[in-house]
Interface confidence: medium
Amino acid sequence: HNTTVFQGVEGQSLQVSCPYDSMKHWGRRKAWCRQLGEKGPCQRVVSTHNLWLLSFLRRRNGSTAITDDTLGGTLTITLRNLQPHDAGFYQCQSLHGSEADTLRKVLVEVLADPLDHRDAGDLWVPGESESFEDAHVEHSISRSLLEGEIPFPPTS
């Protein structure tokens, strides 16, 4: 699996999408987990409804919510009020019994440009790259890690 990077602005919401083959994963619940180190376990953060037919219902754990479009084959995770400690490696998983298949490996990056938190004024000129009304809308960028990029930096 390649790692897909999702970037969100600190304090705003970030939506992570994990597409999958709806037929292959028919009847399976899904989960969102946080990777603990390169070789470590993936710690469950939140999972979809216990009844697969109700997977479309949003389930929440703290500031993280999950919902599954089982027909369209898209798992969506929303991280609200994104904070620097949310940055890190995650996985979207498809559950079957005690096993879990990885649907997508995700790197969440929290962007923290200080100008995003300034009132309109001296430096911040609305209209320069966006309108002031747009400033708090949910935005995200996703991209795949380039070949050769190291997803986990080597530990010293």
Epitope: L111, A112, H117, R118, S129, H139
Partner: antibody
């Protein structure tokens, strides 16, 4: 006129503590996220710590090199921000600036850690 | 961490001539909404850093328009079209996209 005035810097021995104060005026302090940035002699600036506003629950962040030793705090009623520095090391020797990391910077206060 | 490198580390310029300083980032500084979080500062001798350019190419308040910033996701340039005496000091690039915020090593500008 915007002013940030840092005080509290001095010569201390390794392992000791020091508390820096930054008194500000001339801008809406309570809304502004504030930082401490330090600069060792002949070196580039290094970001140290950051504190958000009340509306963000005064969330704090630290550079790895000071995590667990330094504590940033603020008093909105006094328009002041503080840096409590414990277990000081010789490599903490630097001029410490209080700043919004954009336009507003203090003149700095010198912290020297030496035996 | 995001590492910034600058070139040259020192620069000697005749007043009236142009000067160019390069800054390279180990990671892309292009964030959401196509905003590039690269900042330039000038630190005059014995003074605090002062902001020159924010978000790669925007001139900070009160900064003369002989200063300009440009670049891409990882490679950035600060240009001074006609260097003046008051431009002497150390120029730093800085990234404020990810914690920890980081600064470049600095480029010392002096006059010939």
């Amino acid at each position: 006129e915007v002013q940030l005035v840092e005080t509290g810097g001095s010569l201390v021995q390794p392992g000791k503590s020091l508390r820096l104060t930054c008194a500000t005026s001339g801008f809406p302090f309570s809304n502004v996220w504030l930082h401490w940035v330090r600069q060792s002699p002949e070196k580039h600036p290094e970001w140290v710590a950051h504190i958000k506003a009340k509306s963000d629950n005064y969330a704090t962040y630290y550079a790895e090199s000071v995590k667990g030793r330094f504590t940033i705090s603020r008093d909105d009623s006094k328009s002041s921000v503080f840096l409590q520095m414990n277990s000081l090391k010789e490599e903490d020797t630097a001029i410490y600036y209080c700043t919004d990391i954009l336009e507003y910077w203090g003149q700095g206060t010198l912290v020297t850690v030496s035996s | 961490d995001t590492v910034l490198t600058q070139a040259p580390l020192s620069l000697s310029v005749t007043p009236g001539e142009s000067a160019s300083i390069s800054c390279r980032s180990s990671k892309s500084l292009l964030g959401v909404r196509d905003i590039t979080s690269l900042y330039w500062y000038l630190q005059k001798p014995g003074k605090s850093p002062q902001l020159l350019i924010y978000r790669m190419s925007n001139l900070a308040s009160g900064v003369p328009d002989r200063f300009s910033g440009s670049g891409s996701e990882t490679d950035f340039t600060l240009k001074i079209s006609e260097v003046e005496t008051e431009d002497v000091g150390v120029y730093y690039c800085a990234q404020f996209l990810r914690y920890p915020y980081t600064f470049g090593p600095g480029t010392k500008l002096e006059l010939k």
